[in-house]
Interface confidence: medium
């Protein structure tokens, strides 16, 4: 008979035979023959394979190294890798989350537009006119200047992006 040149989904071609791939969570022990099926074995503890495969070795689960600021977000299974994230106050340096860095703080004159997560850094924005930030913070937004008028006071010193306005009593001598 004509040997196959292509096999069905979840099969692979070897020695003119279409053999079944091993399912996720299992590795290949031996290829099928004309008379026997593919032999697969489950991945061991701390190992995984996430696709239909013909791999002879399972992949090791990712290690979330605490020395790099990492911790386990989701424990790996035989079919999935471990997902790492960063400790509180830190975020991943890459999509693969192989190490962490401290969240950046927004300097005075800048406020937090988006608070950092385990995978993204703090996003800062300059305080627009009418707003200020006088601290270096990873959490604080720009605050609006104090409205002296609502307190029946007058502006004694104008605000900047780093300082609030200074209010004072109205000048009673003025006609």
């Amino acid at each position: 008979p004509e040997p196959p040149t292509a096999c069905r989904e979840k099969q692979y071609l070897i020695n003119s035979q279409c053999c079944s791939l091993c399912q996720p969570g299992q590795k290949l022990v031996s290829d099928c023959t004309e008379f026997t099926e593919t032999e697969c074995l489950p991945c061991g503890e701390s190992e995984f394979l996430d696709t239909w495969n013909r791999e002879t070795h399972c992949h090791q689960h990712k290690y979330c190294d605490p020395n790099l600021g990492l911790r386990v977000q989701q424990k790996g299974t035989s079919e999935t890798d471990t997902i790492c994230t960063c400790e509180e106050g830190w975020h991943c340096t890459s999509e693969a989350c192989e190490s962490c860095v401290l969240h950046r703080s927004c300097s005075p004159g800048f406020g937090v537009k988006q608070i950092a997560t385990g995978v993204s850094d703090t996003i800062c924005e300059p305080c627009p006119v009418g707003f200020f930030s006088n601290v270096s913070s990873a959490f604080e937004k720009c605050h609006p200047w104090t409205s002296c008028e609502t307190k029946d006071l007058v502006v004694q010193q104008a605000g900047t992006n780093k300082t609030d306005v200074v209010c004072g009593p109205q000048d009673r001598l003025r006609a």
């Epitope: 008979p1 031996s30 008379f35 026997t36 099926e37």
Partner: antibody, heavy 123, light 107 residues
Framework: EVKLVESGGGLVQPGGSLSLSCAAS????????MSWVRQPPGKALEWLGF??????????EYSASVKGRFTISRDNSQSILYLQMNALRAEDSATYYC??????????????WGQGTTLTVSS | DIQMTQTTSSLSASLGDRVTISCRAS??????LNWYQQKPDGTVKLLIY???RLHSGVPSRFSGSGSGTDYSLTISNLEQEDIATYFC?????????FGGGTKLEIK
């Protein structure tokens, strides 16, 4: 009902030839691998060879003990399996069984057997 | 070739007994192990395939187990009709090979 009936056994002189037949019924003959197995008196079973099914081109495989002397063939129109035996020796004396093969997913096995036919090779 | 060894060539048991017949392969056969029953009149029947799967029509008192190189056939409640010779056969690698057989007799 699957049925296999062998015939053609008898007494043959050393060096002689004989052909055994196996008439199959109760299943689609062309779908199955078919095999011959023998058993010398008081001894174990011995696989001799098989002939593949239609999808696999009706090709054959033989055990080393009979390769070159025995030939397996099939008449698919009549559902008959044959074993042509040449250059017969005394040690070929045995009961000869034809057997049908089971499926790949659980390993090949002989799921149905004939009643056997006896060959005696003696001068 | 893979050698199949049935160390017990004959076995005596009483009706109702639990009987175990063993079979050893010369190398790992990955559970591709079949058991056959041969009656005194020469009739051969498949009992169990792939170590533990019962062939259609075979009574449930027959069971099989094993892995690697060591396998066994168990008859849980011996009946008169079970008097026969039992052969194991490996289906892992050509040439297919059989054990020498275990003849079961009544005490």
């Amino acid at each position: 009902e699957v049925k296999l009936v062998e015939s053609g056994g008898g007494l043959v002189q050393p060096g002689g030839s004989l052909s055994l037949s196996c008439a199959a019924s109760g299943f689609t003959f062309t779908d199955y691998y078919m095999s011959w197995v023998r058993q010398p008196p008081g001894k174990a079973l011995e696989w001799l060879g098989f002939i593949r099914n239609k999808p696999n081109g009706y090709t054959t495989e033989y055990s080393a003990s009979v390769k070159g002397r025995f030939t397996i063939s099939r008449d698919n129109s009549q559902s008959i399996l044959y074993l042509q035996m040449n250059a017969l020796r005394a040690e070929d004396s045995a009961t000869y069984y034809c057997a049908r093969y089971g499926g790949k997913l659980t390993g090949f096995y002989f799921d149905y057997w004939g009643q056997g036919t006896t060959l005696t090779v003696s001068s | 070739d893979i050698q199949m060894t049935q160390t017990t060539s004959s076995l005596s048991a009483s009706l109702g007994d639990r009987v175990t017949i063993s079979c050893r392969a010369s190398q790992d056969i990955r559970k591709y192990l079949n058991w056959y029953q041969q009656k005194p009149d020469g009739t051969v029947k498949l009992l169990i395939y792939y170590t533990s799967r019962l062939h259609s029509g075979v009574p449930s008192r027959f069971s099989g187990s094993g892995s690697g190189t060591d396998y066994s056939l168990t008859i849980s409640n011996l009946e008169q009709e079970d008097i026969a010779t039992y052969f194991c056969q490996q289906g892992n690698t050509l040439p297919w090979t059989f054990g020498g057989g275990t003849k079961l007799e009544i005490k």
